[in-house]
């Protein structure tokens, strides 16, 4: 509450995080021209980057494009990319949605359809949705923790959100233990009214906030956190502003002297964690 | 304008970024010993990296050490490093500037200079410039979206930058289209008075300020972004500061059992989107 | 001090960050069944990654797990994994502080022991101590280079730490060198009182603050940073809740077909560099 | 699924020539070559985008072998010439979205240069 008598002052934090957890992903592989059922295991060094700060990202779906090399070939035929004739593609152009340069060559792509011919990583990204369900749909049962420091330097007071008292097998809960600071993944989304399930497919964005209100007086002292989730992008969103959360990544290698690219298109929750709140003193 | 009657409180934001754009590089490239023009696509994947939050980079140009193995060899022979005799080189010696651990030993570098040997991965970078014009100037004409959710949670107000009447191929405008979140990469470095061909050759690092001043009455309800950018690195910066912005980072892989690697020297632009502004309330 | 007649306002802030150093690291080294001891050089492209912002992360120690392949293999028999008997495995589950998911069956680790077999990257990593002196300790004569710009856009005033008066050949001092802004790494865990060479093993977080107490009136203008170095991580912190700071990442290859990866846990400082203040205007 | 027919295989010489072609059953961006001698791997010989651009070929068979393509008719041949022994092989043809790129070949036509 606001005692206008203190002296208040915005807290200076920190954050750590440290996610656990193991998916199974059954996905179609083809090798040789045929496509059987493949099974991978994925842990965090598969599934997580090394992130700084305030952030950390689970990727929990993917498209691969593999075994892409720099040369020419016949771009993707997305909605209005296909062409008849060579004066439909103009040399040196660069199609915000396409993924390479134009030659000016209309070519064929499969028996049907001819699309433009570009300079680019080849076989192009074929346009094709996220799988459904999610290929790590299991990562909902993965777990973070989150140790938080936080400074009041005017007040020259330190504190962070786990305390000796605290049990490292705890799961958070908002009745019956709020102070844990090991969430499971799949509490924050159901928290914040969201269903992982759905989310996992695109990506999304989920806020965790975590807000000190610090009566720092000796004589009524209370300065512990409060967690709240939210989440960060919009469901609603219009295609044209890309929905969800994905980012694209290469792994790069060299296959009889040809150097080649194994292309991620990775889906995932970022988690922003968000510290906020005050310090006061008399 | 300050209402001195209301409740202010800070923005609690989070920040997502996406960028658009393929470059297309030539540059010389040496094979076999023989040295040929070579061309080749850059995509996201290529100049940009999985970042979080509120910062994002765009490689501009590049420097390539190919092909290192740690071993001994003759250092580069930088102002001041070269050597007559054992005497100048001091076995475990690390100069800051140097790559390597010096042997003690002066060795020939080539047919005219002598520099002392060092354990390193060698042969060691070469102290070259970055390339003149930068290799993917090209990136000018790359987009990036920004989306953007913020919070007053004192106020328990939530909205972002994107609306859903906005039209997704938009392109920022100061007079034109202020309110669009997609911007060209060379109209921000114009609306900061930079010239985007210059500082892609060292990379900087740009600012982009989205400013928040939120009336939340009810009576006179204002709450939209007002973007601005600004230059954050200096560009009159003493040698000795590492003017530009660049960092190293390397692919590493087998070659006959032997372990290698290739050093890229990456100059690039690194954009920084500072949220910060008030909600105020009665 | 607090001028109750002036407007305040909170700095806006960019950093940037430039690690230089060289590290030489001793290990065992096995080889076709025979170990000896490797030497090998450490440059910024190999102990650090290319971060945004306010963090920097320097790898002080790692384990690694080279030649992993996604198969089934018995569990690293860690305290109360060991099994007599198929009973006591599970087939589809997944121990938190296991690498995999569990077949059900119980398998023969080696001569003495047996444990549940599991489907993961083999061999699962071995859960052994960080390596102790720390593989890396000679970092602590890394330097640093912290590039601050701060802006108050209400005052319509922006600065910069290091200002062109500066010498790049300076190193941080409390009394002799108070504004330089090279630290040494050594230096900044001194002034926090801990020990370099002790937190290198498991690693920690190294808080690095920039305080700014800007008084913007023309007539007494003053706005220089201040540096102020404390740990961020609990020293103290029981082993259930993770102490120190490490994180696990890949290097993923293909040997005669057969996909693996190389596993690498990372103990190392992130630092974090914590900018606050405010710029006062009557 | 395309098929694809090769015909032009033989016994010859070595440093003598032999004309490989082979027939598409539809349109196709890229046409190429791949060889596999006994007890080898399947190795990439020559290879063709849309009307003969680009070309691509092994190190090994640079300025012996030519590859060309009839885009109308759906057919790419191989003109072989300067023959060794170690070019003995099944040949086969196959078909693609880029000259790096293949996803169908023929049954393959023997070729056998004798020393």
């Known amino acids: 509450s606001d005692k206008l008598y203190q002296r208040k002052e915005p807290v200076i934090s920190s954050v750590h995080t440290k996610v656990k957890g193991i998916a199974e992903v059954t996905e179609n592989v083809t090798e040789g021209g045929v496509t059987k059922l493949g099974h991978s295991i994925f842990d965090t060094a598969d599934y997580t980057f090394p992130l700084q700060g305030n952030s950390f990202f689970v990727m929990t779906n993917y498209v691969k494009s593999e075994g892409q090399v720099q040369t020419l070939c016949p771009e993707y035929p997305r909605r209005g990319a296909q062409c008849s004739s060579d004066r439909r593609c103009k040399k040196g152009w660069m199609d915000p949605q396409s993924k390479g340069i134009q030659t000016g060559r209309c070519v064929p792509y499969d028996k049907t359809r001819k699309t433009c011919e570009v300079s680019a990583w080849c076989p192009t990204e074929e346009e094709k949705e996220a799988p459904r369900p999610a290929l790590l749909r299991s990562a909902e049962n993965f777990t973070v923790l989150i140790k938080n420091n936080i400074h009041f330097p005017g007040h020259n007071y330190t504190t962070r959100n786990i305390l000796p008292t605290m049990n490292g097998s705890c799961t958070f809960h908002k009745t019956w233990d709020p102070q844990c600071s090991i969430f499971r993944l799949g509490d924050i989304f159901q928290e914040a009214g969201e269903n992982f399930t759905e989310v996992a497919v695109q990506g999304g964005i989920m806020g965790i906030e975590i807000y000190w209100d610090c009566n720092l007086d000796s004589w009524s002292h209370h300065c512990r956190p409060r967690y709240s989730f939210r989440r960060l992008d919009d469901k609603n969103m219009d295609e044209s502003f890309v929905p969800g959360y994905n980012f694209r990544y290469a792994k790069y290698y060299k296959e009889n002297n040809v150097e080649k690219r194994t292309l991620i298109k990775a889906f995932g929750i970022r988690f922003d964690i968000l510290v906020f709140g005050t310090g006061g003193k008399f | 304008s300050d209402k001195l009657y209301q409740r202010k409180e800070p923005v609690i934001s989070s920040v997502h970024t996406k960028v658009k754009g393929i470059a297309e590089v030539t540059e010389n490239v040496t094979e076999g010993g023989v040295t040929k023009l070579g061309h080749s696509i850059f995509d996201t994947a290529d100049y940009t990296f999985p970042l979080q939050g509120n910062s994002f980079f765009v490689m501009t140009n590049y420097v390539k050490s190919e092909g290192q193995v740690q071993t001994l060899c003759p250092e580069y022979p930088r102002r001041g490093a070269q050597c007559s005799s054992d005497r100048r080189c001091k076995k475990g010696w690390m100069d800051p500037q140097s790559k390597g651990i010096q042997t003690g030993r002066c060795v020939p570098y080539d047919k005219t200079r002598k520099t002392c040997e060092v354990s390193a991965w060698c042969p060691t970078e070469e102290e070259k410039e970055a390339p003149r014009p930068a290799l993917l100037r090209s990136a000018e004409n790359f987009t990036v979206l920004i989306k953007n959710n913020i919070h007053f949670p004192g106020h328990n107000y939530t909205t972002r930058n994107i609306l859903p009447t906005m039209n997704g191929s938009c392109t920022f405008h100061k007079t034109w289209d202020p309110q669009c979140s997609i911007f060209r990469l060379g109209d921000i470095f114009q609306e900061a008075g930079e010239n985007f061909t210059e500082v892609a050759v060292q990379g900087g690092i740009m600012g982009i300020e989205i400013y928040w001043d939120c009336n939340l009455d009810s009576w006179s309800h204002h709450c939209r972004p007002r973007y601005s950018f600004r230059r954050l690195d200096d560009k009159n910066m003493d040698e000795s500061f590492v003017p530009g912005y660049n960092f190293r980072y390397a692919k590493y892989y087998k070659e006959n059992n032997v372990e290698k690697r290739t050093l890229i020297k990456a100059f690039g632009i690194r954009f920084d989107i500072l949220v910060f502004g008030t909600g105020g309330k009665f | 001090s607090d001028k109750l007649y002036q407007r305040k306002e909170p700095v806006i802030s960019s950093v940037h960050t430039k690690v230089k150093g060289i590290a030489e690291v001793t290990e065992n080294v096995t080889e076709g069944g025979v170990t000896k001891l490797g030497h090998s050089i450490f440059d910024t492209a190999d102990y650090t990654f290319p971060l945004q912002g306010n963090s920097f992360f320097v790898m002080t120690n790692y384990v690694k797990s080279e030649g992993q392949v996604q198969t089934l293999c018995p569990e690293y028999p860690r305290r109360g994994a060991q099994c007599s008997s198929d009973r006591r495995c599970k087939k589809g589950w997944m121990d938190p502080q296991s690498k995999g998911i569990q077949t059900g069956r119980c398998v023969p680790y080696d001569k003495t022991r047996k444990t549940c077999e599991v489907s993961a990257w083999c061999p699962t990593e071995e859960e052994k101590e960080a390596p102790r002196p720390a593989l890396l300790r000679s970092a602590e004569n890394f330097t640093v280079l912290i590039k601050n710009n701060i802006h108050f856009p209400g005052h319509n005033y922006t600065t910069r730490n290091i200002l062109p008066t500066m010498n790049g050949s300076c190193t941080f001092h409390k009394t002799w060198d108070p504004q330089c802004s090279i630290f040494r790494l050594g230096d900044i865990f001194q002034e926090a009182g801990e020990n370099f060479t002790e937190v290198a093993v498991q690693g920690g977080i190294m808080g690095i603050e920039i305080y700014w107490d800007c008084n913007l009136d023309s007539w007494s203008h003053h706005c220089r940073p201040r540096y102020s170095f404390r740990r961020l991580d609990d020293k103290n912190m029981d082993e259930s809740f993770v102490p120190g700071y490490n994180f696990r990442y890949a290097k993923y290859y293909k040997e005669n077909n057969v996909e693996k990866r190389t596993l690498i846990k990372a103990f190392g400082i992130r630092f974090d560099i914590l900018v606050f203040g405010t710029g006062g205007k009557f | 699924e395309v098929q694809l027919v090769e015909s032009g295989g033989g016994l010859v010489q070595a440093g003598g020539s032999l004309r490989l072609s082979c027939a598409a059953s539809e349109r196709t961006y890229s046409m190429g070559w791949f060889r596999q001698a006994p007890g080898k791997e399947r190795e990439f010989v020559a290879g063709s985008g849309w009307d003969g651009i680009p070309t691509r070929y092994a190190d090994s068979v640079k300025g012996r072998f030519t590859i060309s393509r009839d885009n109308a008719k759906n057919t790419v041949s191989l003109q072989m010439s300067g023959l060794k022994p170690e070019d003995t092989a099944i040949y086969y043809c196959?078909?693609?979205?880029?000259?790096?790129?293949?996803?169908?070949r023929g049954q393959g036509t023997q070729v056998t240069v004798s020393s």
């Open positions: 196959a078909t693609g979205t880029s000259v790096y790129h293949y996803q169908y």
